[in-house]
């Protein structure tokens, strides 16, 4: 049978709350050199044990007996020291354990989670955690808003998650822990109102410089809307921004409404141009969340002056006009030119010249019709710019260079009849 | 001297328990920690659990919790280590092993085959 | 849980060679531990506390390290040396052990 255990002095027991230093203490009786004392815990040997160890020759010769004592020192509580502590000796060809002294928690609950501060949309459900343990166990939480319970008694209600179906006012959520020790008040969290995402963002009219939008506000609780935010930025050709993309590319424009009414005009916009808009809508709780961002675009417009440049010259039956593109904003897409030209006591001439920039006419009457003038006016697909003033032809001088041109023959009578949105009457003839 | 002796070799079924016994002799029973590993055919070693027989605590691997059961009987200082649910890739030696810290002593091991 | 990986998986030496055996933990470790196993026998304990000899244990067999890395040594290996030698931790749970390495005697 083994040999008799060498210790005469085993670990105590030690329970108490987070925290609590305490120490374990074993002693044993040896003949001869004294062992190293390890500690278990659990049977797993402490690797960084904060213990000491100290010995005292009972006579003169080393191989007496000796007195060994190990303290092993817990410094401030957790629950990973609990369980089972032993002292372990190797002495000889042998191995001894003392017996087991027990490190246990007990006291108030300790919080493992506490419900966190928050924002929240009026009117919209969400959820706290909360999460206390012993020992003792159980642990039974009661859950308060505004510092009210919401159950008769620890225990009968909510417990880790409390569901909160909505609220209309910025509201404060505490847990409490119970047990057998008493009970811990977790912190206090904030629950922050904002009002609801703005919906049904849309456009209401349309300006090639302007736009009118308007949208429906969301829920906001007890807490009326101080103004709206609508930012707009330029799409960039579809790159960049994407429905949900949380921020744009660049630098928005910015724009803020009051309200009501919940609509807005956007000025100082470019024509034919494609945008991204988005709106927030802000109580004295704060901001909503923003709107998706909506892809809206401006309309075209007529160009905003007319061509430059032009020059009309005369050379018997034929007349040379040429000009260049109106140096104002075409405000969209350059879709070609208009020409009208009359003479003293003849009909006005409209021509459609498309996209060219020059144009050889073939006059009736050999040249004889006097004070010839010629007007040009630049247009998009709204309709045409302003004319130009009236150029008159100057009769041709040799050493002029004149391009061949396909020649165009004066009809006798006019050529077109315009749309009345197209056919801007000029005032000069 | 310290030994560990463990019962003899099981065949099972799939779906059906095991229950493999281990006397120890030659120390305290009490006083160490009896832990169970196993050696499927071929592979290295795995640890499953310990109890502590001076008062019956266990602890087990994650691995085995719900289908390994370990127990004592201190008046005969004989552990037991009981697996449910047994599957083929259950087929292994078990062996029990007293601890201080490492396994010191095993025993000479419990050859259990699931098969259909 | 720690992962012990050794080195090498197998060595075929001959007697009166020195054999040296690698345990690298995937974390660092206070302690290691060793064992030998022998074909149809249970493990036996060899090493423990990274250094100490086990009761019985040929004063041959020597082992050192700390961290990560760990070392079993054989001076002059003998023939009834030929087993399988595995290293353990349980500076965490669950307690585990390497791979093995196999030794054979030429």
């Known amino acids: 049978q083994a040999e008799e255990s060498p210790f005469v002095g085993n670990p105590g027991n030690i329970t108490g709350a987070r925290g609590l230093t305490g120490t374990l203490r074993c002693q044993l009786q040896v003949q001869g050199e004294p062992p190293e004392v390890h500690w278990l815990r659990d049977g797993q040997i402490l690797e960084l044990a904060d213990s000491t160890q100290t010995q005292v020759p009972l006579g003169e010769d080393e191989q007496d007996d000796w007195i060994v004592v190990s303290q092993l020192r817990i410094t401030s509580l957790q629950l990973s020291d609990t369980g089972q502590y032993q002292c372990l000796v190797f002495l000889g060809h042998q191995t001894f354990v003392s017996q087991p002294g027990y490190v246990g928690l007990e006291g108030l609950p300790y919080f493992l989670e506490e419900p966190e501060d928050r924002t929240v949309a009026a009117n919209t459900p969400f959820n706290l955690s909360c999460q206390a343990q012993g020992p003792p166990e159980p642990v039974d939480l009661l859950w308060l808003q505004d510092a009210v319970p919401l159950a008769t008694a620890p225990g009968h209600g909510p417990q880790r998650s409390l569901h909160v179906p909505g609220l209309n006012k910025t509201s404060s959520f505490s847990c409490e822990a119970h047990n057998a020790k008493g009970v811990t008040t977790s912190r206090t969290a904030t629950i922050t109102v904002l009002p609801q995402q703005p919906r049904n963002l849309h456009l209401v009219s349309r300006q090639p410089t302007e736009l009118e939008v308007a949208w429906t506000p969301g829920l906001s609780g007890i807490y009326p809307l101080t103004h709206c935010t609508l930012q707009a930025v330029l799409s960039d050709d579809g790159m960049g921004i994407q429905a949900g993309e949380p921020d744009p590319p660049e630098e928005p424009l910015t724009s803020q409404a009051s309200v009501p009414p919940h609509q807005l005009r956007l000025g100082s916009l470019h024509p034919h141009t494609p945008y991204h808009i988005r709106v927030a809508c802000t109580s004295s709780q704060g901001p909503s969340s923003w709107t998706h961002w909506l892809p809206v675009e401006t309309p075209e417009g007529v160009p905003l002056g007319p061509p430059e440049n032009i020059s009309a010259t005369r050379n018997g039956s034929q007349a040379f006009v040429h000009w260049q593109e109106p140096r104002a904003p075409l405000q969209g897409t350059l879709l070609g030119y208009r020409l009208a030209y009359q003479g003293q006591d003849t009909p006005e001439v409209l021509m459609d010249i498309g996209l060219r920039q020059e144009v050889t006419l073939e006059l009736q009457g050999d040249g004889s019709v006097s004070n010839l003038t010629v007007c040009v006016a630049a247009y998009t697909a709204a309709g045409d710019g302003p004319w130009s003033l009236p150029v008159p032809l100057e009769a041709w001088r040799p050493g002029q260079a004149q391009p061949v041109h396909q020649l165009v023959k004066e009809p006798s009578t006019p050529a077109f009849s315009w749309p009345h949105h197209h056919h801007h009457h000029h005032h000069h003839h | 001297q310290v030994q560990l002796v463990q019962s003899g070799a099981e065949v099972k079924k799939p779906g059906a328990s095991v229950k493999v016994s281990c006397k120890a002799s030659?120390?305290?029973?009490?006083?160490?920690?009896i832990n169970w590993v196993r050696q499927a055919p071929g592979q290295g070693l795995e640890w499953m659990g310990w109890i502590y027989p001076g008062s019956g605590n266990t602890k087990y691997n994650e691995k085995f919790k719900g289908r390994v059961t370990l127990t004592v009987d201190t008046s005969i200082s004989t552990a037991y280590m009981e697996l449910s649910r047994l599957r083929s890739d259950d087929t292994a030696v078990y062996y029990c092993a007293r601890s201080t810290g490492f396994f010191d002593y095993w025993g000479q091991g419990t050859l259990v085959t699931v098969s259909s | 849980q720690i992962v012990l990986t050794q080195s090498p998986d197998f060595q075929s030496v001959t007697p009166k060679e020195k054999v040296t055996i690698t345990c690298s933990a995937s974390s660092s470790i206070g302690y290691m531990y060793w064992y030998q196993q022998k074909p149809d026998q249970s493990p036996k304990s060899l090493i423990y506390?990274?250094?100490n000899l086990a009761s019985g244990v040929p004063s041959r067999f020597s082992g050192s390290g700390s961290g990560t890395d760990y070392t079993l040594t054989i001076n002059s290996l003998e023939a009834e040396d030929a087993a399988t030698y595995y290293c353990q931790q349980w500076s965490s749970n669950p307690p585990t052990f390497g791979q093995g390495t196999k030794l054979e005697i030429k």
């Open positions: 030659g120390y305290p029973f009490t006083d160490f920690y």
């Open positions: 506390l990274t250094s």
